[in-house]
């Protein structure tokens, strides 16, 4: 019996077509993605073959404008469309709190949505009862499938899940809700959820029972043969796991924002057992046509997204340098403001020993694209922010050594002067360097912001010690030549959008004032 | 033709008796003031005496908890329930901004609210047209008596009046429409106002016309002979002027708070020119008994206070560091939230030229009475405020030269690691000390934020600039030994109460996480 | 949270009939498709009759076919079992199911069912 896995994950509402980078989409002949090109494929697969499933490993929510103004309600409404037959929760699920997923997604979505390691407690426990699932029996042909969902258990340090949802541990509840499945004579389970490419491949050997893994989080790119654009893949597809007792097990991811439409084909014998498995990410390009209903109705919600990106989301009294000649050179307030809000945007529920789980922010200068002019009567638009902001990256947690952030503060002024974007804007820290020593030797003094202490003060970086950090996704990947972050982090989780975070720090804030106060100073 | 005429200002929502230093009254015994005791004294000597004014001077709004939640409703209720017959605007009237006077106040009021040099512009002319008047004719047995109001042209710097509303010169404004009450042959004319001492006896010199000046904002205290309480008198009761065209004009005002009534006979001539004019402010102490059934309406009013003050503002994720072991030998959070606090609540318009017209705090350490501990589920009350600040004092503007505050940052260590109360936390200042050199010789540096920029940044103190600076009233009375504020400054103006700036601080942030940065260091 | 309540069940004689209800709330109704399960002392729970979400497909046991109906007021978010004919072996604990997904045809497996509600008693008496 053969079954066809159609999957997405990370898509973070990247709901229109982008450019190959997943950016904003400038030139329409060569866009890619989007969900009128996405349905274009799935009914093309649907016409062609018996038995597809539709499933999505989470991470829907956040990334552009139409999760900030549609707040959720796009996902469902655009998923429903596409038929989706399961869905993940991812944790970009909460970044809205427990309410902004119930409300616009829970109630609305005609699949099921499912997490078998996320339990609630207190008064909410009633409350989201029986709105998402720990799994779910889809009939599919003759057959039925079973779906276990499972989200990061790190969901509480990277969203805004509220103190009533706890996040067990995957692979522990996991197995008895697949082990119920089994005595349910559910005999072919996928395992679908969103807690990263290392988690995945333990739930695929942990896990008895589970005969595929569809993942995400991670970004994964697999592929099997030449790759059709950028993306390097980090394996084969599917990545075969050998499991505790002795199966092959597929395990597979498919990038993220929508680009690819994962495509996994399995044969199973009568008693479920996955005899082969085979395919491939399909690249979503403009070879493939955006289906005109769809496309019709992603213009008509589009309507909003124009009006909304010029209205006053709050005020600056005054200039928000965000000039190359400030940012690469000096501490500037944008650099400041920025990294303030990146801080605002990581305030979690901690242990008591805690004040917050991260007090840290770095920014490469040359990301500032646009200051800010204040003699508009101060009003701050979306707009003027993704001028500032115009890459569409994400504001990410990484965890680093302290010997790795020295290098990288080394990194921000090894070659000081001619205007290049690694100069690093900061929060939490205070940097001193002295430029007549030689590069690599720069930095005289690295105070960092402590995090296990009840009043925050600044103490000197610890080389062995481990750091969290926000920065934007494209430090964490080495970009601007931050190959010593790229290689020596030890963890990383991505983050929300970056104009999303400012916005809503300007918008919480009402009227900002930052100033240039002494985070980098040169001795 | 005798006139009495009775006058309070500055009032600040003293609508309970207080203690003698008009704080929260402890031991009731020996409390004073408060609308129900000054009732009592007013119908007394309205019975007593044919012609009797009751004219409030402004600055009834922001003092206390009353304020806080009636929000001037307070103030039109029980100035409405004591008859007075005219209040003039202050500056404080304006700190919920226009619609914050508009509704509760001068559509409540029962009586005349008076100002001749604000002028509406724009779309508020229309809507205010009317709801205050420049003057008012009042009649009194068979005569009549103008009233004209003037408002302190400092008030678009000292409180929220915004854009379109113009304060003129008083001198200028009022001019026109005394000769207006000439044409109109009143012929015994009051200006009652808000401008301060040294504004008043500059109207009763330059204009023509005025007769008495009925005054407020600089919480003068005037006496004749011994005076019976704490507060020395500037000057006499009344204090004499001589205009420009020779004629004695009484200028009065009567301390603060509700402490005292001010008690003026005047005598005029057939054609209204003042013969002789005598009193002396009339302290309302407990030998005055409280007026029962106002006191019964204040006590009725009072239970939505003691709701109010246990209700949660905002949330610390932060302990904040109010102890004396921190704040008297060190920079402190506590100190930083407040004075953070302190800026945030004196933003206003200014001009193009400055980002803000003040950049600066400074606060005693020994005014930081209590710590707030963050492990009672992060809330922050009133009630909890109350305890970091107990004695119900005001944030004030004042403007001091360079070298004044350098004598005061000396002074501010002069006895360093004594626990003594003059140590300074701070805003928009970077200090350090050198605690090896003498007293009077250890600031060895003192950075402040710019104002004059359109990027704050910190730059050095010079000795010959004037510099505006917001600080508690205790160190502007040159409270812990701060002399040489009292005895320097070139201007001061009393500003909003010191719980209120902070609570509402917090309200708007919603979670505060104020760290120890680098402020105040030693070297 | 998503709730099923059935009503509508009692004492019938043979060749009577009953109209069950059953009523959902918590999730969009047209987002459910809509089952009857029946469970008599000592046997298996057993499928009656279902209703896709769109009431336009529907699905009922050999036992039933002809006598059995199940409509669906989406206004109301109610579904209905109408039993006409009814017989002894008809006697059992009825179960009112959802599953939540949009499927043309509802399905006859008890394992696809999501939510369930707690029974209503049916017997037929000779």
């Known amino acids: 019996w053969e079954l066809t896995i159609l999957h997405t994950n990370d898509v973070h509402s990247r709901l229109e077509q982008t450019s190959e980078d997943s950016s904003k989409c400038v030139n329409a002949s060569r866009c890619m993605g989007g969900v009128a090109r996405l349905f274009t494929k799935v009914q093309q697969i649907r016409r062609a073959e018996p038995n597809v499933l539709l499933l999505d490993a989470g991470d829907q929510y956040q990334g552009t404008i139409w999760f900030t103004v549609y707040k959720g309600a796009e996902v469902a409404h655009f998923m429903n469309a596409l038929r989706y037959d399961a869905m993940a929760l991812g944790n970009h699920e909460f970044d809205n709190g427990v309410e902004g997923l119930i409300e616009p997604l829970l109630k609305e979505a005609k699949f099921p949505i499912l997490s078998a390691n996320i339990k609630a407690k207190g008064p909410l426990a009633s409350q989201i009862s029986g709105l998402y699932l720990p799994y779910k029996v889809l009939p599919v042909g003759d057959e039925v499938v079973g779906i276990v969902g499972y989200t990061s258990k790190e969901t509480p340090f990277l969203s805004n899940p509220g103190t009533n949802l706890v996040f067990e541990d995957e692979i522990t509840a996991l197995q008895p809700e697949v082990d119920k499945l089994k005595t349910l004579n559910v005999n072919k389970i996928i395992a679908l959820g969103h807690s990263g490419f290392e988690t995945d491949k333990l739930i695929a050997q942990k896990v008895r029972g589970v005969d595929v893994v569809v993942g995400g989080h991670s970004n994964t790119f697999l592929y099997t043969g030449n790759p059709p654009s950028k993306e390097v893949p980090a394996g084969k597809y599917p990545f075969i796991v050998t499991s505790d007792d002795g199966r092959k097990v597929p395990v597979v991811q498919a990038y993220a924002f929508g680009k690819y439409l994962g495509y996994l084909k399995i044969e199973f014998d009568e008693r479920g057992n996955v005899i082969s498995s085979h395919g491939n990410p399909i690249l979503l390009n403009s070879s493939i046509p955006e289906d005109p209903s769809i496309k019709a109705d992603i213009n008509k919600w589009r309507i909003k997204l124009d009006n909304y990106s010029t209205q006053e989301l709050g005020k600056t009294i005054v200039y928000l340098d965000g000039s190359s000649q400030s940012c690469r050179f000096r501490e500037c307030n944008m650099g400041n403001l920025i990294c303030d809000a990146m801080i605002n945007n990581n305030l979690r529920h901690a242990d008591e020993m805690f004040w917050n789980h991260v007090s840290m922010c770095i920014l490469n200068g040359g990301g500032i694209r646009s200051p800010i002019d204040e003699r508009n009567n101060g009003t701050i638009t979306w707009e003027n922010l993704a001028a500032v902001l115009p890459f569409g990256g994400t504001f990410d947690l990484v965890q680093l050594k302290g010997s790795t952030l020295k290098k990288a503060f080394e990194h921000s002024v090894h070659r000081y002067g001619q205007s290049t974007g690694e100069f690093l804007q900061v929060g939490g820290i205070h940097v001193v360097y002295d430029l007549s020593r030689k590069p690599g030797d720069r930095v005289v003094k690295l105070d960092v912001l402590c995090t296990k202490c009840r009043v925050p003060s600044y103490d000197p970086l610890k080389m062995d010690e481990i750091y969290k950090v926000i920065l934007p996704n494209f430090l964490a990947n080495g970009g601007d030549g931050f190959q010593m972050i790229k290689d020596e982090l030890l963890r990383h989780d991505s983050g929300d959008q970056d104009i999303n975070v400012v916005s809503t720090y300007i918008s919480k804030m009402k009227v900002i004032y930052p100033a240039v106060e002494g985070r980098i100073k040169f001795s | 033709w005798e006139l009495t005429i009775l006058h309070t200002n500055d009032v600040h929502s003293r609508l309970e008796q207080t203690s003698e230093d008009s704080s929260k009254c402890v031991n009731a015994s020996r409390c004073m003031g408060g609308v129900a005791r000054l009732f009592t004294k007013v119908q007394q000597i309205r019975r007593a005496e044919p012609n009797v004014l009751l004219l409030d001077a402004g600055d009834q709004y922001q003092g206390t908890i009353w304020f806080t939640v009636y929000k001037g409703a307070e103030v039109a209720h029980f100035m409405n329930a004591l008859r007075y017959d005219a209040m003039a605007l202050g500056n404080h009237e304006f700190d919920n901004g226009v619609e914050g006077l508009i509704e509760p106040l001068l559509k409540e009021a029962k009586f005349p609210i008076l100002s001749a040099n604000i002028k509406a512009k724009g779309p508020l002319a229309s809507q205010i047209s009317g709801l205050y008047l420049p003057y008012k004719v009042l009649p009194v047995g068979d005569e009549v008596v103008g009233i004209v109001g003037y408002t302190s042209k400092e008030t678009p710097f000292l409180s929220n009046p915004g854009t379109n509303l113009v304060f003129e010169d008083e001198i200028t404004a009022l001019q026109p429409e005394v000769d207006k009450l000439k044409t109109l042959n009143v012929n015994k004319i009051i200006a009652l106002g808000h401008s301060g001492f040294e504004t008043d006896k500059l109207i009763a010199q330059k204009v023509r016309g005025v007769d008495v000046v009925v005054g407020g904002h600089s919480n003068t205290f005037l006496y004749t002979g011994n005076p019976p309480s704490k507060e020395v008198p500037a000057g006499k009761y009344p204090f004499i002027v001589t205009s420009d065209d020779g004629r004695k004009v009484p200028v009065v005002q009567a301390y603060a708070f509700g402490k005292y009534l001010g008690y003026l006979k005047i005598e005029f001539d057939e054609r209204g020119n003042v013969i002789s004019s005598h009193g002396n402010p009339i302290l309302l102490n407990s030998s005055i008994p409280e007026d029962p059934s106002i006191k019964a309406d204040i006590n009725k009013w009072r239970i939505k206070l003691d709701n109010y003050s246990t209700q949660e503002l905002g949330k610390t994720i932060v302990y904040l560091d109010g102890s004396s072991q921190s704040c008297r030998f060190r920079e402190c959070n506590m100190g930083n939230l407040i004075c953070d606090a302190m800026i945030n609540n004196n933003l206003r318009h200014a001009d193009e030229m400055f980002w803000n017209h003040v950049s600066m705090c400074i606060l005693n350490g020994g005014g930081i009475r209590s710590p707030i501990d963050e492990r009672n589920n992060g809330t922050i009350t009133w009630e909890n405020l109350a305890a970091v600040l107990p004695f119900g004092g005001t944030f004030d503007l004042v403007q001091l030269k360079g070298s004044t505050l350098k004598k005061a940052f000396e002074h501010s260590v002069h006895r360093y690691g004594q626990s003594t109360g003059e140590f300074l936390q701070v805003g928009g200042i970077h200090v350090v000390y050198d605690l090896s050199r003498k007293p009077g010789d250890r600031v060895v540096k003192l950075d402040v934020l710019c104002t004059k920029c359109r990027v704050p940044s910190y730059d050095p103190l010079k000795m010959d600039e004037i510099y505006k600076v917001i600080l508690p009233n205790f160190l502007a009375n040159g409270g812990d030994g701060f002399q040489m504020i009292k005895d320097e400054l070139l201007r001061h103006d009393s500003g909003d109460q010191d719980i209120n700036v902070v609570s509402t601080y917090i309200s708007k942030m919603k979670v505060i996480y104020p760290a120890v940065e680098g402020r105040i260091k030693f070297s | 949270e998503v709730q099923l309540v059935e009503s509508g069940g009692g004492v019938v004689q043979t060749g009577g009939s009953l109209r069950l209800s059953c009523a959902a709330s918590?999730?969009?109704?047209?987002?459910?498709?809509m089952g009857w399960f029946r469970q008599a002392p000592g046997k298996e729970r057993e499928f009656v009759a279902a209703i896709s979400n769109s009431g336009a497909g529907t699905q009922f046991a050999d036992s039933v076919k002809g006598r059995f109906t199940i409509s669906r007021d989406n206004a109301k978010n109610t579904v209905y079992l109408q039993m006409n004919s009814l017989k002894p072996e008809d006697t059992a604990v009825y179960y009112c199911a959802a599953d939540w997904g949009t499927r043309d045809s509802p399905s006859k497996l008890n394992a696809v069912y999501d939510y369930w509600g707690r029974g209503t008693q049916v017997t037929v008496s000779s």
């Open positions: 918590g999730r969009t109704f047209t987002h459910l498709a």
